[in-house]
Interface confidence: low
């Protein structure tokens, strides 16, 4: 909320954009205020919260030759590689004078296919011996479903039907392969394929 | 996390001066202002003034412009009001607190009650 | 300088009740720009700090139950509980920020 002496017009004239997308996406949010007298330090909050390492950079340009005439100044948050932890409401922040302002926020939005938080391992088992493999993954959007393959061969009849996060197995008498797909609204990951190695009796 | 602490009281004289503490902790000091309120007891809420560290700039609620200093120390980031001419009147609890910025959690101190008697 | 006043100074309800308060500002609180009312609403209950409600005349601040509502315009203001529950005992204040701060005198709640 301002601070000062009295509350003046906002002097955002450019407020941040929305991304949404992928993990891993790079994206830049924009800022643009005019300002009277010497530019101030932008500042980016996501969630209410200043962003201390955040990886901006701010330009700045005078309208005019007087140090009391206006400026322009920009200020360009880039986000590297898009994670979850980088999701949220951003907005810039400028103190001026006794006052702080922010902007209208924007939304960073994170959105794909499903990504794996664990994957099926490699494992040697002995033979008719019972095992289990674990696979767990995450949108958004969510609901992720899951489906577990045998040897390419699909162990439920769709998606989000028959085992999810844990497969029991109750034995092999050969040496096999598993993997797991992920379906969300966006589309399917594939899991690594595990080899599991039955021992010869 | 973030944290304001202030010392639980002080004792002083009539017509002493004293100066109240408030360390700043689990954020970047410099950029949120730090507000003063006065409570006396069974009362209400009394904004004193603000200072913004990282320039030191201040506003005062007219009522206490003689009566108190907010000052801050950067590389111990602590805020600081003093008093001085102390009178009973100004027995009280004060408390700090960090400035928020929409939705961002505010913080208060626990307030430091002073009490000023002889 | 911006006067708060508030209504009623004291108030005595039983559990599960509805309770409205008032504050009203000397001077409208609304920036026509940035299209923020800066009128917050603080909890204080006995023996510890105040705590922030409501923030922009409406907007619950992270955490705070949904039973309390704040609402108004310009220079009315009303925190409405829905609901009161024992643990809502507490003063009330409401604070303007529109120009530096001031306290209204604040409400205290009173559970029967």
């Known amino acids: 909320a301002p601070r000062g002496t009295q509350a003046e017009e906002s002097p955002f004239v450019g407020n941040p954009g929305n991304i949404t997308g992928a993990r891993g996406l790079t994206g830049t949010l924009r800022c643009q205020l005019q300002v009277q007298g010497e530019p101030p330090e932008v500042h980016w909050l996501r969630d209410g919260q200043i962003l201390e390492l955040a990886d901006s950079t701010q330009t700045q340009v005078p309208l005019g030759e007087d140090e009391q005439d206006d400026w322009i100044v920009v200020s360009q948050l880039r986000i590297t590689s898009l994670q979850l932890s980088d999701t949220g409401q951003y907005q810039c922040l400028v103190f001026l004078g006794h006052q702080t302002f922010v902007s209208q926020p924007g939304y960073v939005g994170l959105e794909g296919l499903p990504y794996f938080l664990e994957e099926p391992e490699d494992r040697t088992v002995a033979a008719n011996t019972p095992f289990n493999l674990s696979c767990q993954a995450q949108g958004p959007p969510e609901p992720v479903d899951l489906l577990w393959l045998q040897d390419a061969v699909p162990l439920a009849t769709a998606p989000g039907h028959g085992p999810q996060r844990s497969l029991h197995v109750p034995g092999l008498n050969k040496t096999s392969s598993f993997s797991c797909e992920a379906h969300n609204a966006k589309g399917v990951t594939t899991s690594r394929t595990a080899t599991i190695t039955v021992l010869p009796q | 996390q973030v944290q304001l602490q202030q010392p639980g009281a002080e004792l002083v004289k009539p017509g002493a001066s004293v100066k109240l503490s408030c360390k700043a902790s689990?954020?970047?000091?410099?950029?949120?202002?730090i507000n003063w309120v006065k409570q006396r007891p069974g009362q209400g809420l009394e904004w004193i003034g603000n200072?913004?560290?990282?320039?030191?700039?201040?506003n005062y609620n007219e009522k206490f412009k003689s009566k108190a200093t907010l000052t801050v120390d950067k590389s111990s980031t602590t805020a600081y009001i003093q008093f001085s001419s102390l009178t009973s009147e100004d027995s009280a609890v004060y408390y700090c607190?960090?400035?928020?910025?929409?939705?961002?959690?505010?913080?208060w101190g626990q307030g430091t009650t002073l009490t000023v008697s002889s | 300088d911006i006067v708060m006043s508030q209504s009623p100074s004291s108030l005595a309800v039983s559990a599960g009740e509805k309770v409205t308060m008032s504050c009203k500002s000397s001077?409208?609180?609304?920036?026509?720009?940035?299209?923020?009312?800066?009128l917050a609403w603080y909890q204080q209950k006995p023996g510890q700090s105040p705590k922030l409600l409501i923030y922009w005349a409406s907007t619950r601040q992270s955490g705070v139950p949904d039973r309390f509502t704040g609402s108004g315009s310009g220079t009315d203001f009303t925190l409405t509980i829905s609901s009161v529950q024992a643990e809502d005992l507490a003063v009330y204040y409401c604070?303007?920020?529109?120009?530096?701060?001031?306290f209204g005198g604040g409400t205290k709640l009173e559970i029967k």
């Open positions: 607190t960090r400035d928020t910025y929409g939705g961002s959690p505010d913080y």
């Open positions: 604070k303007q920020s529109y120009n530096l701060w001031t």
């Open positions: 001077q409208s609180l609304l920036n026509s720009r940035t299209r923020k009312i800066y």
């Open positions: 200072i913004y560290p990282d320039s030191s700039s201040t």
């Open positions: 689990g954020y970047t000091f410099t950029s949120y202002w």
